[in-house]
């Protein structure tokens, strides 16, 4: 009996948003199965997604243990158990992933405007502090808990009646901006980590406009 045509995985790609982290690869298996292993640079390899025919593996549980560590994964290819093959002894084929440091590389998810409140010519806009899957003392941390002052938000706002946008920035989750009395404004926010070299910005939040349910207007 001959050897099997086991092929090594390729195109190993990290897909990560707000620390929810999936490793994807190709090809779809034919007469083979995969096992993923993950390790930090100094740690032991740990098997995940063992003996699977999937081409993705959720590694969130591992990377959230320390999001500032750098991780490496590898995908092993094994001939399926129903394949009658005999060859000389040989290590299984595997392919290494690129290195991945969650704190520096996870994509920032699309933020959401939680509320806005107008008091006279001031508007307070609050950004929802999204929960992540990172845990400390058995509770899930928010994006702000994890990133602290490394995370800022940029607010884009404009009069409903015009297209000229203004911007404001905050290193909290709240903005206090000046507006013209009697005018309705629309808002959109973006999460930013200025210190990053990659994945610095999120996509823009959905637009929210005054005169809709999210806001509150108080004439003083």
């Amino acid at each position: 009996s001959g050897t099997t045509n086991t092929v090594a995985a390729y195109n190993l790609t990290w897909k990560s948003t707000n620390f929810k982290t999936i490793l994807e690869w190709e090809p779809k298996p034919v007469n083979q199965v995969y096992t993923v292993q993950i390790s930090t640079k100094s740690g032991d390899w740990k098997s995940k997604c063992f003996y699977t025919t999937d081409t993705e593996c959720d590694l969130t549980d591992e990377i959230v243990k320390d999001v500032k560590q750098t991780y490496l994964a590898r995908v092993f290819s094994y001939p399926a158990g129903n394949v009658e093959s005999t060859g000389s002894a040989g290590e299984p084929l595997y392919e290494n992933s690129p290195e991945f440091t969650p704190y520096l590389e996870t994509n920032l998810g699309q933020p959401t405007i939680q509320s806005f409140e107008q008091v006279g010519t001031k508007v307070n806009v609050t950004v929802e502090d999204e929960r992540t899957l990172v845990r400390r003392n058995n509770t899930f941390l928010s994006l702000r808990d994890v990133f602290g002052k490394d995370l800022i938000y940029t607010l884009y706002y404009w009069k409903s009646s015009s297209s000229g946008k203004k911007t404001a920035k905050t290193n909290t989750n709240e903005f206090l901006i000046d507006v013209d009395k009697g005018e309705n404004y629309c808002f959109s926010v973006q999460a930013v980590i200025p210190s990053r070299t990659v994945n610095r910005k999120s996509t823009d939040s959905p637009v929210e406009c005054m005169g809709q349910e999210k806001g509150e207007f108080r004439e003083i």
């Epitope: 050897t3 099997t4 086991t6 096992t35 032991d44 390899w45 740990k46 098997s47 995940k48 063992f50 003996y51 092993f76 094994y78 001939p79 158990g81 394949v83 009658e84 093959s85 005999t86 060859g87 000389s88 002894a89 040989g90 290590e91 299984p92 084929l93 595997y94």
Partner: nanobody, 114 residues
Framework: QVQLVESGGGLVKPGGSLRLSCTAS????????MGWHRQAPGKGRELVAV???????HYADFVKGRFTISRDNAKNTVYLQMNFLRAEDTAVYYC????????WGQGTMVTVSS
């Protein structure tokens, strides 16, 4: 060529237990998968259980809760503890190790009968 030698098969009554062992003739890397398949009379070979070098396991649905696979990397040995055996577990049980290729033992017969 990796040689795998099984032992522990035999005749057992329904509800009884057996422990199969399989030892490789040479050092098996921890990156190898080791496991067990079985072939009942007149049927094809089917997966029973497999185990990684760091002890992660995968079982066929029909043995979950009854069979336990374990592995001793230092001894190049894999075990299959079989409890609550049923007549339909009667088969030849084959040890296997998978690296770049699959390596199979000669098989050990398990007969469950009253």
């Amino acid at each position: 060529q990796v040689q795998l030698v099984e032992s522990g098969g035999g005749l057992v009554k329904p509800g009884g237990s057996l422990r199969l062992s399989c030892t490789a003739s040479e050092t098996i890397s921890s990156t190898y998968i080791m496991g067990w398949h079985r072939q009942a009379p007149g049927k094809g070979r089917e997966l029973v259980a497999v185990i990684s070098g760091d002890g992660v396991t995968h079982y066929a649905d029909f043995v979950k809760g009854r069979f336990t696979i374990s592995r001793d990397n230092a001894k190049n040995t894999v075990y299959l503890q079989m409890n609550f055996l049923r007549a339909e577990d009667t088969a030849v049980y084959y040890c296997y190790a998978a690296g770049r290729w699959n390596h199979w033992g000669q098989g050990t017969m398990v007969t469950v009968s009253s």
